[in-house]
Interface confidence: low
């Protein structure tokens, strides 16, 4: 066992926001996502707009703990999910062998110092394979209907094209601009630079020396220590609390 009070304290850590501090950060998530039964999905969150140090990230489904990534201790996957949950990429979580029961809300809870706790929400819908197939079939007539509608619209447009050419051009430009902005916005969101091998905390968020190396030995031991999680967090013999 490589840590003492640091562990129990840093891990038992429940970080509340500082009363005096402004929580400026924001959590960006993959939002609402769907996947096929039997498949896999990556849950991804990203904390931005804050210089706070990420001490730990919890992944929870409703009130069930899935996994923890602790800056000092590395990853811990809850025993009941070990077969189907894989850490990463980065601070994300990969769910495998999805079942319909996996449908629901997932939360990434970032414990930071000194800001406190940030929570992101992702809604996952797991679809039956057959439902997904039916959905694809229904899309064909739907596309046909859309095409017919477009033909009608185009005809109408052609009738008035001479009168509205200038306005139409402006309108198309505006729409293209909006689309471009949305696209750019989506590109802006991406997980931070990959962490060093074995690392769980973003390179820019972790203080020097934290999580920069594989902590396999510690993590293996942790399986003996991590029991039932009651709320949304951990501390260190200082491990029973936090690491400053």
């Amino acid at each position: 066992m490589r840590w003492c009070l640091l562990l129990i304290w840093a891990q038992g850590l429940r970080q509340a926001p500082l009363a005096s501090g402004m929580m400026t950060g924001t959590i960006e998530t993959t939002g609402n996502i769907s996947a096929e039964k039997g498949g896999s999905i990556i849950l991804q969150c990203h904390l931005s707009s804050t210089t706070a140090q990420v001490t730990q990230v919890n992944w929870e489904q409703q009130d069930q703990l899935l996994a923890i990534c602790n800056a000092d201790l590395g990853w811990h996957i809850s025993p009941s999910f070990k077969d189907r949950v894989a850490p990463g990429p980065g601070l994300g979580l990969t769910l495998q062998s999805l079942t319909v029961n996996d449908t629901g809300e997932y939360f990434c809870i970032y414990h930071t110092y000194p800001d406190g706790t940030y929570t992101g929400r992702i809604f996952l819908e797991v679809l039956e394979s057959s439902v997904a197939e039916h959905g694809a079939r229904f899309q064909i007539p739907l596309l046909g209907a859309m095409a017919a509608t477009l033909v009608v619209i185009c005809t109408a447009v052609i009738v008035v094209v001479a009168l509205t050419r200038k306005k139409k051009a402006l309108r198309i430009h505006s729409v293209e601009g909006d689309l471009r902005r949305k696209s750019a916005g989506q590109e802006e969101w991406s997980p931070s630079a990959p962490s060093p091998p074995g690392s769980c905390v973003q390179a820019e968020a972790a203080p020097a020396g934290l999580c920069g190396e594989q902590r396999g030995e510690d993590c293996a031991e942790l399986h003996d220590y991590f029991n039932v999680l009651s709320y949304r967090s951990l501390g260190n013999c200082s491990f029973f609390t936090e690491t400053g």
Epitope: C4, L6, F226, S230, L234, G235, T241, T243
Partner: antibody, heavy 121, light 112 residues
Amino acid sequence: EVQLVESGGGLVQPGRSLRLSCTASGFSFDDYAMHWVRQVPGKGLEWVSGISWNSITIGYADSVKGRFTISRDNAKNSLYLQMNSLRAEDTALYFCAKDGGNRKYYGMDVWGQGTTVTVSS
Amino acid sequence: DIVMTQSPLSLPVTPGEPASISCRSSQSLLHSNGYNYLDWYLQKPGQSPHLLIYLGSNRASGVPDRFSGSGSGTDFTLKISRVEADDVGVYFCLQALQTPCSFGQGTKLEIK
């Protein structure tokens, strides 16, 4: 008033079991890590075990690993130490202690008065 | 495991005089976060221990400023600027960096 009260100590034969309890009052028990520390009369202090506020992290001294189990019930403001396969060398005064901080380490800032465990045939 | 060694084991002091206790660890207690995970506790006769200093040099709440902690890495010192009769007891250092946490053997301070 912040207070920790240990109970459950007593005389027990070698190889038998005993369960110590520590009841907390005067603070938000579920916010803090807790520890068990023991002291052989007239001797020094020995850290026995510690547990994070949410039971996620648990640690043991090598001398008790595999025999003692620490646990807590936040709803009851209680800390426990299940001691199995007791040995004569486990005879001591057992203190429970509160961790001082829930954001940064602040030492063990509150201690109980202790409960005596005597292992003898 | 980290071994903590205190000296002296016995310290007779005249009231009003300063006192100094040394604690040495077998490994550095300086964490990468910049903190030294070393505490000092005082156990008065017939009482439970109580916290004096945490993280090497931080005085616990209610502890008189006569007490100060210093040091880094493996060598630490607890100083009492002016000893009072109420300061008698056994002083313990504790390393809180690695599990298992470990205490020093204790230094018994007594009044001359």
